[in-house]
């Protein structure tokens, strides 16, 4: 009897370890999306970027969905969201539209139940990129902890999209779930 | 029999609490490394920074290894990586070699199995640090979520290392494990 | 006997699932605090920002306390801390006191047991905001992984507080617990 119970206990421990590990894995959605360099719009207006990679190089996604430029939440929770956006210009690309630039990023959340869009985080800088220098570069990083519900969508808006650095290490955004909602 | 089983159940619960807590702790490597101010290289070229503290002040490491300027992964997993790099110049340090600067950071991953180095994240800015101002300062922050395998190494490269701010609150990088690989 | 044990095992699994889920939730304090725009100090000196929202819009707090401008740790652990601080100036607000600005943020930790304050992270930039441009903007982001003890307090200091952007998506700071202390 006693040995039998101990064997059951070992089974409990074993199955629990599997279950805990499995549920932990399943409970932690994440995404790291990198800019799709083949489809960067031009202009100095603010635009919602629609083309991101989710499955090549550093880009990856699990238990979240990527569709038409939006990162879709599949699981309620508190997530850490982040974005890194790099802008650059080389004189060989031709003159800048203006030397006074507003280089900005906005991380927005859209609720499809109530069609509305809200900015969660913003960052950036006004820059004077003078013709005296042949190369200009500037990066923005933002990050924060947010409650996200299943079905909500995260997207990235930037100003001056034609100046985006198309490298996967330069322009990306992502999210990972930290904890459940109580 | 029934009481005995209940006692065993209590033991299971108790041992499980310990086991879960312990395995959770062991499953979460981290590091926060701060610049070693006594060994900052000079020059304006791009260099890999090799001297970091791992056990004084805010610096700490657990279940990861620091060796020869590289943060070595001991446990497969998805990690959040970050870096904060500050540059500064005071006129009392003498004139800058040039007023047009490219202040950059690159967070790189090296795989020793396949000797290759890849940039995971980059950030920075071109700056015009004119002689009209006696003090100049600029900080870069980058962060992202990456799959790391045991044995892979993370290192930090910067341009203009002689301009680095040597404070532990200024120039640092780190990582913490968020979840296992499926 | 054997059926009874299996029933007990099922109970163990069930109660454990509840317990694990509950303890996981309780073990993860977090906060995301957004600037209180109605109470931003003026001036160009460095000040500790004391007015933050903790329960409206994106602002939230759980298992941590906010009091007198400080985020108080209630539970020992390793936390990821972050701050995003935006500065802006529009010519319609009148002339700047000086065109040469030092826009900085300092994330500080105060220990009430040993009354002392230490800077965990800093970031920022010197800026030349010339009168040639009608609008200026600049954002700082910092983040890092720190060991925090119950009773310790996190606060935010900035230079030039009168230039702070009062939007909740612009100026905020936060923390979330990643793991226990061994």
């Amino acid at each position: 009897g006693s040995q039998h119970i101990r064997a059951e206990k070992a089974m409990v421990d074993g199955s629990w370890l599997d279950l805990a590990k499995r549920s932990k894995l399943e409970a932690q959605p994440f995404a790291h999306l990198t800019i799709n360099a083949t489809d960067i719009p031009s202009g100095s207006h603010k635009v919602s970027l629609s083309s991101w990679y989710h499955d090549r190089g550093w880009a990856k996604i699990s238990n979240m969905t990527f569709s038409n430029g939006k990162l879709i939440v599949n699981q309620d929770g508190f997530y850490y969201l982040y974005a890194n956006i790099c802008f650059r210009h080389h004189e060989t690309s031709g003159d800048l539209a203006t030397e006074y630039l507003q280089l900005m990023v906005y991380v927005t959340k859209t609720s499809i139940k109530i069609p509305s869009s809200h900015t969660l985080m913003k960052g950036g800088s006004t820059k004077y990129w003078s013709g005296n220098s042949e190369f200009h570069f500037y990066s923005i990083n933002v990050g924060g902890f947010f409650k996200l519900r299943s079905g909500e969508e995260i997207s990235i808006e930037v100003s001056n999209p034609s100046l985006l650095d198309p490298d996967q290490d330069a322009t990306y955004f992502g999210a990972f779930k930290v904890r459940d909602i109580d | 029999g029934s009481q005995h089983i209940r006692a065993e159940k209590a033991m299971v619960d108790g041992s499980w609490l310990d086991l879960a807590k312990r395995s959770k702790l062991e499953a979460q490597p981290f590091a926060h490394l701060t610049i070693n101010a006594t060994d900052i290289p000079s020059g304006s070229h791009k260099v890999s920074l090799s001297s970091w503290y791992h056990d004084r002040g805010w610096a700490k490491i657990s279940n990861m290894t620091f060796s020869n300027g590289k943060l070595i992964v001991n446990q497969d997993g998805f990690y959040y990586l970050y870096a904060n790099i500050c540059f500064r110049h005071h006129e009392t340090s003498g004139d800058l070699a040039t007023e047009y600067l490219q202040l950059m950071v690159y967070v790189t991953k090296t795989s020793i199995k396949i000797p290759s180095s890849h940039t995971l994240m980059k950030g920075g800015s071109t700056k015009y640090w004119s002689g009209n101002s006696e003090f100049h300062f600029y900080s870069i922050n980058v962060g992202g979520f990456f799959k790391l395998r045991s044995g892979e190494e993370i290192s930090i490269e910067v341009s203009n290392p002689s301009l680095l701010d040597p404070d532990q609150d200024a120039t640092y990088f780190g990582a913490f494990k968020v979840r296992d690989i499926d | 006997g054997s059926q009874h044990i299996r029933a007990e095992k099922a109970m163990v699994d069930g109660s454990w699932l509840d317990l694990a889920k509950r303890s996981k939730l309780e073990a993860q304090p977090f906060a995301h605090l957004t600037i209180n725009a109605t109470d931003i100090p003026s001036g160009s000196h460095k000040v500790s920002l004391s007015s933050w929202y903790h329960d409206r819009g994106w602002a939230k707090i759980s298992n941590m306390t906010f009091s007198n401008g400080k985020l108080i740790v209630n539970q020992d652990g390793f936390y990821y801390l972050y701050a995003n601080i935006c500065f802006r100036h529009h010519e319609t607000s009148g002339d700047l006191a000086t065109e040469y600005l030092q826009l900085m943020v300092y994330v500080t930790k105060t220990s009430i047991k040993i009354p002392s304050s230490h800077t965990l992270m800093k970031g920022g930039s010197t800026k030349y905001w010339s009168g040639n441009s009608e609008f200026h903007f600049y954002s700082i982001n910092v983040g890092g992984f720190f060991k925090l003890r119950s009773g310790e307090e996190i606060s935010i200091e900035v230079s030039n507080p009168s230039l702070l952007d009062p939007d909740q998506d612009a100026t905020y700071f936060g923390a979330f617990k990643v793991r226990d202390i061994d």
């Epitope: 489809d39 719009p41 031009s42 202009g43 100095s44 207006h45 603010k46 635009v47 919602s48 970027l49 629609s50 083309s51 038409n68 430029g69 939006k70 539209a97 203006t98 030397e99 006074y100 630039l101 507003q102 900005m104 906005y106 859209t110 499809i112 069609p115 869009s117 900015t119 997207s155 808006e157 100003s159 999209p161 034609s162 | - | 529009h90 010519e91 319609t92 441009s133 009608e134 609008f135």
Partner: antibody, heavy 117, light 108 residues
Amino acid sequence: QEQLKESGGGLVTPGGTLTLTCTASRFSLINIGMSWVRQAPGRGLEWIGYIYSGGSPYYANWAKGRFTISRTSTTVDLKMTSLTTEDTATYFCARHASDGGWYLDIWGPGTLVTVSL
Amino acid sequence: DMIQTPASVEVAVGGTVTINCQASQSIGSNLAWYQQKPGQPPKLLIYLASTLPSGVPSRFKGSGSGTQFTFTISDVECTDAATYYCQQAYTASNVDNAFGGGTEVVVK
């Protein structure tokens, strides 16, 4: 209430030049994008181009070379050269959304430009 | 650049009308819809494909992303008689026209 008003329209002969001006009232054009759009009689809307604060403009393919957009902190101008009868239309100026998006949330009433001998 | 269909549509009061807009390339959610009544300038009804500015009735609905977009008016009222235009707000280079050709909505 925030308003825009176009001025400078009227009759012009083919080959001529005309400059239209857009003036804002009760809001500043600082840090705001502005578009020019035209509409020929009985036809649809046609985007001409836009300009942002301190910036150089972007134009529709057909407008490059003949149309020039410029701005001050209070006005936005549209200069049109080598005008033809095809340019006869009502010309609108419109403000971009204050967040920088290319969404036209305030429009002027329009000014009619007639190109005729 | 933007193809809008149909060119004209008739709808009864209380009915529903649907207008389609197709972009020549993917524009994500960067699309706006406008209403224009005779002798007036256009009025912004929807931006970012589905977001309503304040003051616009919820009877107006936008959807879609990428290259296919839909604009719907439900519970149509007499005052909805107007011409409706879509506008891409994605790229400002190599643009022939940012606007669609328009759809005239006639209310019976």
